[in-house]
């Protein structure tokens, strides 16, 4: 039983560590400016990284990720004629 308990604790501890390291990795990605310099969308936050809260870091990183995905789809459609990857959200605006 003690082994089982240890196993459960170890598993829980590993998950916490994974989450922490994922958060640190995300912060490092943002700090390094991963996602490129291509601008997009309204309201891009130009504040220095040091002033942002952790929520802001995650939001900014997600915003960069979204831009990158949008550009990938664009390139696939216009330079690769991959029409299946088009953005077709007619009801959005």
């Amino acid at each position: 039983r003690r082994d089982v308990a240890h196993g459960i604790l170890n598993e829980a501890y590993r998950k916490v560590l994974d989450q922490l390291s994922a958060g640190k990795h995300l912060q490092s990605l943002v700090a390094r400016g991963v996602g490129g310099s291509l601008g997009g969308g309204a309201g891009d936050d130009a504040e220095p990284l040091s002033k942002r809260h952790s929520d802001g870091i995650f939001t900014d990183s997600y915003s960069r990720y979204r831009k990158q995905m949008a550009v990938k789809k664009y390139l696939a459609a216009v330079l690769g004629k991959r029409y299946k990857q088009r953005v077709k959200n007619k009801g959005r605006r």
């Epitope: 550009v71 459609a77 216009v78 330079l79 690769g80 959200n89």
Partner: antibody, heavy 107, light 109 residues
């Protein structure tokens, strides 16, 4: 695909170019703006997607704004400088282009 | 950001001959999404080749594209007078969208 709105403007005077499309569902295509200074090469400005989100080259961010309606795509040059003198092209994806509209920025 | 360098410029050849235009990117072109455009004076660019080697509909098979990664080539065989134009390569760049090469003028003798 047809561009309009190009004219002579003084530096700092905002200018909006319009790309009018017919027979094209803007909800199914990307629309791209590209410019070409006199005697120079092509320069990619940015694009707008089906959902109305616009993306720009880093040098163009803040200098241009792309927006659209159901039949038109606009390119606003927020504060033109002499370096913005060029022919501005609008393209559906990159396979159907307009003839371009000339913008001259001079004091 | 990728920088696309085209060589040579200008390039000239006789009618019926072959010309080769090179396009080198400073970094790998995303997905090999590289296109070639033809532009004549006073006209908009015309798409010839997309995804490095695929021929756009309606473009003569005399035009062909090849290459991958950072090195791409446009070949025009059986050169015609009508082929006199400036040719641009354009590559996919995730950080900058589309990067155009500086252009190569083709002169037909």
């Amino acid at each position: 695909v047809e561009e309009s709105g190009g004219r002579l403007v003084t530096p700092g005077t905002p200018l909006t170019l319009t790309c009018t499309v017919s027979g094209i569902d803007l909800n199914s295509y990307y629309m791209t703006w590209v410019r070409q200074a006199p005697g120079k090469g092509l320069e990619w400005i940015g694009f707008i997607d089906a959902g109305g989100d616009a993306y720009y080259a880093s040098w163009a961010k803040g200098r241009f704004t792309i927006s659209k309606t159901s039949t038109t795509v606009d390119l606003k040059i927020t504060s033109p400088t002499t370096e913005d003198t060029a022919t501005y092209f609008c393209a559906r994806d990159l396979d159907l282009w307009g003839q371009g509209t000339l913008v001259t920025v001079s004091s | 950001a990728a920088v696309l360098t085209q060589t040579p410029s200008p390039v000239s050849a006789a009618v019926g001959g072959t010309v080769t235009i090179n396009c080198q990117s400073s970094e790998s072109v995303y997905g090999n999404y590289l296109a070639w455009f033809q532009q004549k004076p006073g006209q908009p660019p015309k798409l010839l080749i997309y995804e490095a080697s695929k021929l756009e509909s309606g473009v003569p098979s005399r035009f062909s594209g090849s290459g991958s990664g950072t090195q791409f080539t446009l070949t025009i065989s059986d050169l015609q007078c009508d082929d006199a134009a400036t040719y641009y390569c354009a590559g996919g760049d995730i950080s900058e969208g589309v990067a155009f090469g500086g252009g190569t003028e083709v002169v037909v003798k």
